[in-house]
């Protein structure tokens, strides 16, 4: 997250981290039920660990943390790497969470966000595109949902209904390492960090997010059948 601020501890209890090896963060994720996460489909890896209830970027133990393995990764059937359409994936964890003040699911928004809606994006991603500076703790950033027209003007030929743009003034954006993390608007999960330009946080180059309102049925059906 570029030019965000430290999240309050336990204020994003649905925020997850996907880790390679013992503790290398590569993507964010969102807890949506006691045993299921959502992340971006482009975050798919054959082997990874899941960390929930953690505030710090470092692997130091925190009392609220819970660690899991992913036993099933189900990318949306319409996703085709390295495209951006339908960029979401369900992950089933090896067990259910212990519900606590640090670890809680978030409800998915059934209605699509409208222009001007204020939202919160969070993640442990780099705070500067070209230098890979990492925050000490989870970062939060208020962003505003942009109109479809402005979104399409920013990225001609690249935007479809499975995406929405959100941003703020130049200098504030999600960035590398935030992929798959949550965009929460009015207390409900509206999007996932998906893509954007490089470097992050350029004028007229907003972040682009998976438009989860388009996928509520697929998410429910897939969880029920697995």
């Amino acid at each position: 997250i570029v030019n965000g601020s430290d999240c309050q501890k336990d204020a994003q209890p649905w925020q997850g981290a996907l880790l390679l090896g013992p503790n290398k963060l590569y993507c964010g994720a969102v807890l949506i039920s006691p045993q299921w996460l959502l992340t971006a489909a482009h975050c798919r890896k054959p082997v990874f660990r899941i960390r929930l209830g953690h505030h710090s970027m470092s692997p130091v133990y925190e009392s609220g943390q819970q660690m899991f393995q992913g036993i099933k990764s189900i990318p949306h059937p319409g996703y085709s790497h390295p495209g951006h359409s339908n960029d979401l994936m369900l992950i089933k964890m090896n067990r259910k969470i212990r519900d606590s003040h640090s670890v809680k699911p978030v409800e998915i928004a059934c209605d699509c966000a409208t222009e001007g809606t204020r939202c919160m994006v969070s993640g442990w991603g780099t705070t500067s595109s070209s230098h890979n500076n990492f925050p000490k703790v989870l970062q939060c950033l208020n962003i505003t949902v942009l109109s479809e027209e402005r979104c399409k003007n920013s990225y001609p030929g690249q935007i479809d209904k499975t995406m929405f743009c959100a941003g703020d003034e130049e200098g504030r954006d999600s960035c590398q390492g935030d992929s798959g993390g949550p965009v929460v608007c009015n207390g409900k999960l509206q999007g996932l960090v998906s893509w954007g330009d490089f470097p992050c946080a350029q004028r007229n180059r907003p972040g682009v997010y998976t438009n989860l309102c388009e996928f509520v049925k697929w998410i429910k059906d897939t969880m029920n059948s697995n």
């Epitope: 390679l20 090896g21 991603g125 798959g180």
Partner: antibody, heavy 124, light 107 residues
Framework: QLQLQESGPGLVKPSETLSLTCTVS??????????WSWIRQPPGKGLEWIGN???????YYNPSLKSRVTISVDTSKNQFSLKLSSVTAADTAVYYC????????????????WGQGTTVTVSS | EIVLTQSPGTLSLSPGERATLSCRAS???????LAWYQQKPGQAPRLLIY???SRATGIPDRFSGSGSGTDFTLTISRLEPEDFAVYYC????????FGGGTKVEIK
């Protein structure tokens, strides 16, 4: 299948500007999933990254060459170009163009498609 | 600037043998941001490994990558005749750079 082809003069005089073009076929340059790179290799030596250009035309250059390098894109021709000014004999090399992939995960996908390279000699 | 040092400079081995190539960074590099390439004479480099340990499309499983921090390794479990080439590591954690290369030659 995506292919990259470098083109440009094989001989450049010292102090002049080296200009090369990379033509992309079998795919489109204006894609928000990819960046486009120039890399060079002096005779008998290793690889040196020169710079990248991204979807919006934003660029990222090797700090040691930054003052002399310009990378640009012409989407109408599906080409991107390299200009290196004030060349010396040390700029004699095989110049490669390549494609890399990027997203907002914290992950480097490497450069998966390369041109075959074009030899540029700097000599009077 | 992150400097990558590859060793050995030349590795003389026979087909069927195991090759272990080292890449050492002057400062810590995220393993997610390290790649390996193979280059044969007169050809462009070919991507072998990305993210330190993931094989690129079409790369046989005799090639494997490992490591973290400042020390990374490319291993070729059983050398085939077509594997004799120069191998480069690359980091993209900060301003991208390549190692000096390791030549794997027939003994």
């Amino acid at each position: 299948q995506l292919q990259l082809q470098e083109s440009g003069p094989g001989l450049v005089k010292p102090s002049e500007t080296l200009s090369l073009t990379c033509t992309v076929s079998g795919g489109s340059i204006p894609s928000s999933s990819y960046y486009w790179s120039w890399i060079r290799q002096p005779p008998g030596k290793g690889l040196e990254w020169i710079g990248n250009i991204y979807y919006s035309g934003s660029t990222y250059y090797n700090p040691s060459l930054k003052s002399r390098v310009t990378i640009s894109v012409d989407t109408s021709k599906n080409q991107f170009s390299l200009k290196l000014s004030s060349v010396t004999a040390a700029d004699t090399a095989v110049y490669y163009c390549a494609r890399g992939e990027y997203d907002r995960s914290y992950y480097f996908w490497g450069m998966d498609v390369w041109g075959q390279g074009t030899t540029v000699t700097v000599s009077s | 600037e992150i400097v990558l040092t590859q060793s050995p400079g030349t590795l003389s081995l026979s087909p069927g043998e195991r090759a272990t190539l080292s890449c050492r960074a002057s400062q810590s590099v995220s393993s997610s941001y390290l790649a390996w390439y193979q280059q044969k004479p007169g050809q462009a480099p070919r991507l072998l490994i990305y993210g330190a340990s993931s094989r690129a499309t079409g790369i046989p499983d005799r090639f494997s990558g490992s490591g973290s921090g400042t020390d990374f390794t490319l291993t070729i479990s059983r050398l085939e005749p077509e594997d004799f080439a120069v191998y480069y590591c690359q980091q993209a954690f900060s301003s991208p750079s390549f190692g000096g290369g390791t030549k794997v030659e027939i003994k």
